[in-house]
Amino acid sequence: KEEQTTFRDCAEIFKSGLTTSGIYTLTFPNSTEEIKAYCDMEAGGGGWTIIQRREDGSVDFQRTWKEYKVGFGNPSGEYWLGNEFVSQLTNQQRYVLKIHLKDWEGNEAYSLYEHFYLSSEELNYRIHLKGLTGTAGKISSISQPGNDFSTKDGDNDKCICKCSQMLTGGWWFDACGPSNLNGMYYPQRQNTNKFNGIKWYYWKGSGYSLKATTMMIRPADF
């Protein structure tokens, strides 16, 4: 059997025998275009493709539509993998989405969606989610049904004013909705009563800005 040299996601890399967490090169489905991603090969059985990470405020997440499309930041630290790659990948087969959260008091929680995909750019990378489980709230903090993605220069929300400008960051804003993991990063003791922080309402409430977040995906049949 010929050795696989290109990989669509971290699950394929894991199955090929590369089981160390780190940065790997992924290839777009049906293309030779490449993208660098962080693969978590330890958590929950491994094979997770990290599509978002916040941990220290080192990267500015108030970015343009194009930047959210192609990705930005550093896969070894804070980054956004890119809506176009995630859209193409999650329309190839069924993926699960796991969102791992940390607060400033040492607590951790997660939300796991058993089916996740993003629509195409023509449909504003609308998020589609089904089947929530986990410890970060019994109700989804990503509004259901899913919303279109919005950025500071691409306003697709349901608010009378622009959520991305007000709350900062690109996200699937509703009006503006119970979450924004791409909001402003606030350090400890400055992280409460924040209008525009890193928010996951059904775990920590409206004004609490989180310490760390990771969004990761993996094929449902892994």
Epitope: K162, C163, C176, G177, Y201
Partner: antibody
């Protein structure tokens, strides 16, 4: 469409009480913090009170603290303002208003506003 | 509390002219958390601008907001007859929420 309709205003003597209501429709009431504001005749706008979407948090302007109580009944999509120990300076048109952003409570812009209900405190 | 001072108190202009309304804060408004409202006689206020410069849905683009820190401006590029009203600024940067005293825009 989003609609807010206030009721309960009227003429009342100083020291007496009045309860205002605001019936909300056209949006998910439970997702939004709600406010009361007021406008004395011929004067400007003044913020009075806010209640969070879940009813757990309430804040008031200093001039009404201890006299006014904001509350809500999410099962009835209704906001209330209980006004006790009324004074002549409380005479105003009282407006209820929805916060501009859902799942947030406190500091926000307002949209929309109701049409207002007039409260006159006079002996 | 943050005190907002609007100027001028009254502005007399003709349709077609440009109107510039000022709102000055007693201390810096973080995050440009400032809104503008229009109020006509016997009506409730109507949101025009939030976040200092973002148009509310359905507001004509002849209205524009600008500014940061302590100085904010509402500009109406070309006055229409329906624009003559009272305009209020409001800050939601710190508690309590406060409004300016208003600017009356009247027909000259």
């Amino acid at each position: 469409q989003v609609q807010l309709v206030e009721s309960g205003g009227g003429v009342v003597q100083p020291g007496r009480s009045l309860r205002l209501s605001c019936a909300a429709s056209g949006f998910t009431f439970t997702n939004y913090g709600m406010h009361w504001g007021r406008q004395a005749p011929g004067k400007g706008l003044e913020w009075v009170a806010v209640i969070s979407h879940d009813g757990n948090n309430k804040y008031y302007v200093d001039s009404v603290k201890g006299r006014f109580t904001i509350s809500r009944d999410n099962s009835k999509n209704t906001l209330y303002l209980q006004m006790n120990s009324l004074r002549a300076e409380d005479t105003a048109v009282y407006y209820c208003a929805r916060e501009g952003i859902d799942f947030w409570s406190g500091l926000n812009w307002f949209d929309p506003w109701g049409q207002g209900t007039l409260v006159t405190v006079s002996s | 509390e943050i005190v907002l001072t609007q100027s001028p108190g009254t502005l007399s202009l003709s349709p077609g002219e440009r109107a510039t309304l000022s709102c000055r804060a007693s201390q810096s408004i973080t995050g440009s958390y400032l809104a503008w409202y229009q109020q006509k006689p016997g009506q409730a206020p109507r949101l025009l601008i939030c976040g200092a410069s973002s148009w509310a849905t359905g507001i004509p683009d002849r209205f524009s907001g600008s500014g940061s820190g302590t100085d904010f401006t509402l500009t109406i590029s070309r006055l229409e007859p329906e624009d003559f009203a009272v305009y209020y600024c409001q800050q939601y940067s710190s508690s309590p929420i406060t409004f300016g005293q208003g600017t009356r825009l009247e027909i000259k």
